[in-house]
Interface confidence: low
Amino acid sequence: APSCPQNVNISGGTFTLSHGWAPGSLLTYSCPQGLYPSPASRLCKSSGQWQTPGATRSLSKAVCKPVRCPAPVSFENGIYTPRLGSYPVGGNVSFECEDGFILRGSPVRQCRPNGMWDGETAVCDNGAGHCPNPGISLGAVRTGFRFGHGDKVRYRCSSNLVLTGSSERECQGNGVWSGTEPICRQPYSYDFPEDVAPALGTSFSHMLGATNPTQKTKESLGRKIQIQRSGHLNLYLLLDCSQSVSENDFLIFKESASLMVDRIFSFEINVSVAIITFASEPKVLMSVLNDNSRDMTEVISSLENANYKDHENGTGTNTYAALNSVYLMMNNQMRLLGMETMAWQEIRHAIILLTDGKSNMGGSPKTAVDHIREILNINQKRNDYLDIYAIGVGKLDVDWRELNELGSKKDGERHAFILQDTKALHQVFEHMLDVSKLTDTICGVGNMSANASDQERTPWHVTIKPKSQETCRGALISDQWVLTAAHCFRDGNDHSLWRVNVGDPKSQWGKEFLIEKAVISPGFDVFAKKNQGILEFYGDDIALLKLAQKVKMSTHARPICLPCTMEANLALRRPQGSTCRDHENELLNKQSVPAHFVALNGSKLNINLKMGVEWTSCAEVVSQEKTMFPNLTDVREVVTDQFLCSGTQEDESPCKGESGGAVFLERRFRFFQVGLVSWGLYNPCLGSADKNSRKRAPRSKVPPPRDFHINLFRMQPWLRQHLGDVLNFLPL
C-alpha cells in the first residue's frame, strides 16, 4: 500500500503520527502555548495523499498562528477599553458601568493562551428585572432586552466564532434563566484542565447530591453500596475507539474512565456503570442490566479488558450508534422494572462521552439524545434525571457545535468541553471529585416539592429548648455545629438542661440532642450601651453550639451552606479561586434581596434584605423607637454595619421565639445563610396563644416594624476562629 509523503513539517511547531506514514494514520500538529496550528491535522488517505479535514482547497503549508480572544460586540449600560477587533494572549479588557448600574462579574479580564477569557462575563445591572440581566458574553450578540418572567433572550456569535451553551434562554418563575450561559469561542480554542475539573466536578457533585440516598440508616454502612437504599445513578461511559485515536490515547481514555469509576463508587450512593467502546459500531463491555455493573472491581476489570483491536475492522466514528446503545439499554431496563414504577422513574442517568472527533457515520447523534430524553421523560421538572457530558479530546477534528448540541444545558453548569490532549483528560478526572469533602454532608439542599414537610424544606432548621422561658432557633452548619444568637444564652451559663431539637425522618417531632459546648461571642453584651440611653444593644449577637453527638444526615437534617466556604462555592457553582467578597457580591446583589426565615410553626416566611441606600432608610426608623432608645442621636450606635435590615412593605417580621434562626436565600436550587435573626421593633406573636397565628402591625404603627439580622459576612473573623477545622473557608 502506498505511504503518504513526509514533507509535512510545520514551521515553529511539531507533529505526531498515529500509525506512521501508512494510510489511515492521523497526523496531528501542535504549537507552543499561545499559538495554534493551522491546519490542526491531516489524514493519510488510501491513495497515499494527505487530506486536511474540512479543507476545500489543496494542501496548504502548515503554520503556527497566534491565538487571539474574541472582542465584545456590544456591552450594555457601560463602556469597555481598549476597543480592539480581537485581543492577543495576555491582553486585558476593562469594564465600567454607567451611574445607577452595578457591575457583576469581572471588571478586568485577560486573554489566556487557549483563546479563552479568564473571569466571568461583566454585566451592568440595576436589579430591575424578575431575573438578573443575563449579560452578553464576549463575541456574542443578544436579542431581547426584557428580563421579566417568561421573557426570552437569544444569542448568536459574531464572524467565525462557535457558540457553546444555550442560544436561547428564558426567565423562569424562580428568577433564574433557563439553560446555561452561552460563550463564543474560537474554533481552535480548548479548555484548560484546571477549569474543566471544577466545572465538571461541580455539576457532577450537584447530581450526586441529588442522588445521595438520604433516608435514615441506623448504622454506618461504610463504603458498601446498598442497592436497596433509595436514589440510584446509572453512569454510562462511552469511549471513542475510532481510527484517529492512537492506542496510547485509548489507554488514557481507559485510565481516565477507571479514575471516574473509582471516584463515583466512593460516594455513598447506589450506582450502576455501563462501559461502551465505539468506532463504526458500539461494543457493550458492561451493561447496567448486569448485576456486576454495581460492583466496582467488576466494572474496572471490564474496562481493563477493553481492547483497542476490538474495532480494527470498522474505524469510523459512529457516535449515534454509541448513544443509541445507551437508549436500548435504558429501554430494556424500563421494560424490566416497569415504566410506571418508582424503581425506574427515580434512577438518575449520566452519560460521559469521551471522543476525539466528530461523528462521521450513522446519522446525527442528536437523534439518539432526543430518544433518550423522551424515554426518560425529561422535562423542566425532571431535568435533573439526565446529564450528558460531551468531552472532546485533542484539538484536531473535534466539532464544537456537535459537542455543544449533545451536552446538557443547565444553569451555571457546563457539560461540553474540549481538552488539548489525553494527558489533560487524565488530569481532569483525577481532580474533578474531591470525595472527602463532598460525600454526605452536602449543604443547602432542601426538598422543594409541594408535598414535602416544612422540615424537609428547611432541614438545617433546629429548635433550641431551654427548660423554661422562650425557645430560640438555630441552623445546622455542619453535622455537629449549630449557629444561633448569643442573646438566647443571656440568662446564665448552665447549658446542661438545654436541648437542641433536630429534624429526624422517623419522627415529625424531631430528635433531641444535648449541647457539648456553647461558644458565645465575647463581644455580646446587651447592656453595653446603657449609659448612652440605649437600653438594649445586640452587637455581636452570635453563638455556636457544638452538639454532644453528630447528627445523621437525612432528608430532615442537613446543614445550610455558609457563604465564604468551599462547600458554598461548590453549591454556587463558582470557579475555584473565588473569594468571600465574590460570594457577598453574588448573594447580596440588589438594593432589595428576597430572603426567608423559618416561623415558629416551621413554615418559610419571606422578607427583603435592604442593601446600600435602602439599608440606610430601613435602619433610620429606629430613631422613632423612644422606649428602648430614649435619647438616641445616631442610629448607627444601635444599628451597626453588623446588621442586615428588613421589615418594610409586605415583609413578615420574626417573633420573639424565632431569634437565632437562619436568614437565608435560594440560589441555583441550593440555600445559603447570610444572616441570623437577632432583634426587631415589633413582635407579631405577642398575645397570640397559637403558634400558627401572627398579627400584622397596624399600618399606623409608630415606629413601623423593622427587623435586624446579624450579617454573616461581617462576622467572618469570629466564624473562622471557631469553625476553621469544621468548614473550608475561602480567602476574604
Epitope: 433509595s230 422517623k506 419522627s507 417531632w509 403558634k691 400558627n692
Partner: antibody, heavy 119, light 106 residues
Amino acid sequence: QVQLVQSGAEVKKPGASVKVSCKASGYSFTTYYMYWVRQAPGQGLEWMGIITPSGGSTTYAQKFQDRVTMTRDASTTTVYMELSSLRSEDTAVYYCARGYEGSYGFDHWGQGTLVTVSS
Amino acid sequence: SYELTQPPSVSLSPGQTASITCSGDKLGNKYTCWYQQKPGQSPVLVIYQDNKRPSGIPERFSGSNSGNTATLTISGTQAMDEADYYCQTWDSSTAVFGGGTKLTVL
C-alpha cells in the same frame, strides 16, 4: 399521676353527631399532644387525629377529614372530639391518648367511650 | 396509603420467646411503637422508638426495627402476657396501626 377521664357511653341515631370529652390531669396540659383513636367491636385500632393543646392546631386522618372536629379548652384542660353524620360503622370505643412526640408513642390512654350508632 | 401487616395470631408455651413481626415498606426508616391490649382494657405502650421501654414495662419486652420489618420480642413469656399486640408508626403526619396480633400463652 397522669389521668385521662372520658365522658360516658352514648347511643346515637344515624346522621346525628356525637361529642366526646377527655379531661386531662396530673401533668402540664400544653406540653403534650392529644390523639384520638377508635376501635370497632372485635377490630383493631384506628387513628383519627391529633390536637395541639397549646395552640389548638389539628391534623385529621384522611378518612375522617370531613366529619371530625377536635377542640380543646385550656382553662379546663379538656379536649373534645366531635364526629358528625354518624353511620352504623362508626359504632366503636373512642379513646383519647396522650403523647409527648410521635416517636414516643401514646403513653397514657383514657378509659374509652363506647358510641353506639343504631336506628 | 401506608400499611402495616402483622400475623393474626402467635401461640406458644410459658417460658418460650415470642416474636411478633410487623412489616411495612421501608419500615426501618421510621420509628415504631408497640401496644399491648388486654380484653376490656385500654391499650398500654410497651415499646417506643423501635426499642425503648417506658418505665414500668418489664425487661422481657424488647423491640428491633430494620429493613421492612419491626419485631416485638417477649422473652420468657408469662401467662399475664396473653393479649392483643399492635405495632404503630407515623407516615407523613398520620399515625398508622397494624391489624394486631393475638398472643396466646398455652
